[in-house]
């Protein structure tokens, strides 16, 4: 008889066998044979493996370094690995975020325009016409002039992107 | 059509040795493990153990290893279990049953034969 | 060896009942399950391999599920030819064991 060449979805081919993968968080022991099927062992602690597999290991739970930045943003399964972020005031600096980096601040003339995250970067903006920034922050957007006319004074000094406009008491008209 | 037809029933005293047959039709008997299960009157299934044709290897459910002996014959396509030194305890139905040899189907027992009722007295 | 326990050893029903039988194992035995229908005549018949693999030529309306020591058979709409006996088997570990069985009978 002909051994297979192919196995079914969630078996694999060895000796001429179609033995089962181990599930999920289970790693190879044995392989099958005629009378015996695949055996499998769960993950140990700290360990994972996410497919259905034919390893004869497991893989390490990632570690999310304190001295990197790093936290734990989700525990790790037997089925999962662990999600790390950053702490706060950080952000990864790749998609794996295997290390964390200060977020930076808008310098003056510039806004915030979005919010850092643990895993993204402060997005800055220049501020437009009527708007200023005068400080380097990472939270502060782009304020807006203040309205001389409102407060019943007027323009002494015109603002800038990062300066706000100085008002002064109306010339009084002489008589 | 898959078949899995059995020799008839038994009657024998105790002390003595039964040999029952399986004849195979409707699929390759060389791709097929034959196992052999025994029922007990009213009670559940208990395996006894596999024969693998193409090469004669066997695998026993240890209860069974000094009571059993499984054998093929490739030509006929036919299975035989021999029962020895037979007690009241062996009377019992008696089935044939296969699986695929090389797994694709896991490990089901996928056809039965009809059962061989031996029964033990004197 | 693996004990395999069906705490139901009958159980009686209506037709178009949907109905479940459970089956536990002594240890984990990683999905490694067969169910299998005896009919009152004797006729053993292969139900679901793998825990929920339906065999081919088995109406759908069987169906098998369960996970690590704890699996079920469910018959979603029970029909009079189901009237038998149903036993699960594992086969994670030699010696291949079965359960004690559940028979089936129409209300």
């Known amino acids: 008889p002909e051994p297979p060449t192919a196995c079914r979805e969630k078996q694999y081919l060895i000796n001429s066998q179609c033995c089962s993968l181990c599930q999920p968080g289970q790693k190879l022991v044995s392989d099958c044979t005629e009378f015996t099927e695949t055996e499998c062992l769960p993950c140990g602690e700290s360990e994972f493996l996410d497919t259905w597999n034919r390893e004869t290991h497991c893989h390490q739970h990632k570690y999310c370094d304190p001295n990197l930045g790093l936290r734990v943003q989700q525990k790790g399964t037997s089925e999962t690995d662990t999600i790390c972020t950053c702490e706060e005031g950080w952000h990864c600096t790749s998609e794996a975020c295997e290390s964390c980096v200060l977020h930076r601040s808008c310098s003056p003339g510039f806004g915030v325009k979005q919010i850092a995250t643990g895993v993204s970067d402060t997005i800055c903006e220049p501020c437009p016409v009527g708007f200023f920034s005068n400080v380097s922050s990472a939270f502060e957007k782009c304020h807006p002039w203040t309205s001389c006319e409102t407060k019943d004074l007027v323009v002494q000094q015109a603002g800038t992107n990062k300066t706000d406009v100085v008002c002064g008491p109306q010339d009084r008209l002489r008589a | 059509e898959v078949q899995l037809q059995q020799s008839g029933p038994d009657l024998v005293k105790p002390g003595a040795s039964v040999k029952i047959s399986c004849k195979t039709s409707?699929?390759?008997?060389?791709?097929?493990?034959m196992h052999w299960v025994k029922q007990s009157h009213g009670k559940s299934l208990e395996w006894i153990g596999g024969?693998?044709?193409?090469?004669?290897?066997?695998s026993y459910n240890q209860k069974f290893k000094d009571k059993a002996t499984m054998t093929v014959d490739k030509s006929s396509s036919t299975g035989y279990m021999e029962l020895r030194s037979l007690t009241s305890e062996d009377s019992a139905v008696y089935y044939c049953t296969r699986r695929e040899v090389y797994g694709r189907n896991y490990y089901a027992l996928d056809y039965w034969g009809q059962g061989t009722l031996v029964t033990v007295s004197s | 060896d693996i004990q395999m326990t069906q705490t139901t050893s009958s159980l009686s029903a209506s037709l178009g009942d949907r109905v479940t039988i459970t089956c536990s194992a002594s240890?984990?035995?990683?999905?490694?399950l067969n169910w299998y229908q005896q009919k009152p005549d004797g006729t053993v018949k292969l139900l679901i391999y793998?825990?929920?693999s339906l065999h081919s030529g088995v109406p759908s309306r069987f169906s098998g599920s369960g996970s690590g020591t704890d699996y079920s058979l469910t018959i979603s709409n029970l029909e009079p030819e189901d009237i038998a006996t149903y036993y699960c088997?594992?086969?994670?570990?030699?010696?291949?064991?079965f359960g004690g069985g559940t028979k089936l009978e129409i209300k």
């Open positions: 088997q594992q086969y994670s570990n030699l010696p291949y064991t």
């Open positions: 024969i693998i044709p193409n090469n004669g290897g066997t």
């Open positions: 793998y825990t929920s």
């Open positions: 240890q984990g035995i990683n999905n490694y």
């Open positions: 409707g699929y390759t008997f060389t791709e097929y493990i």
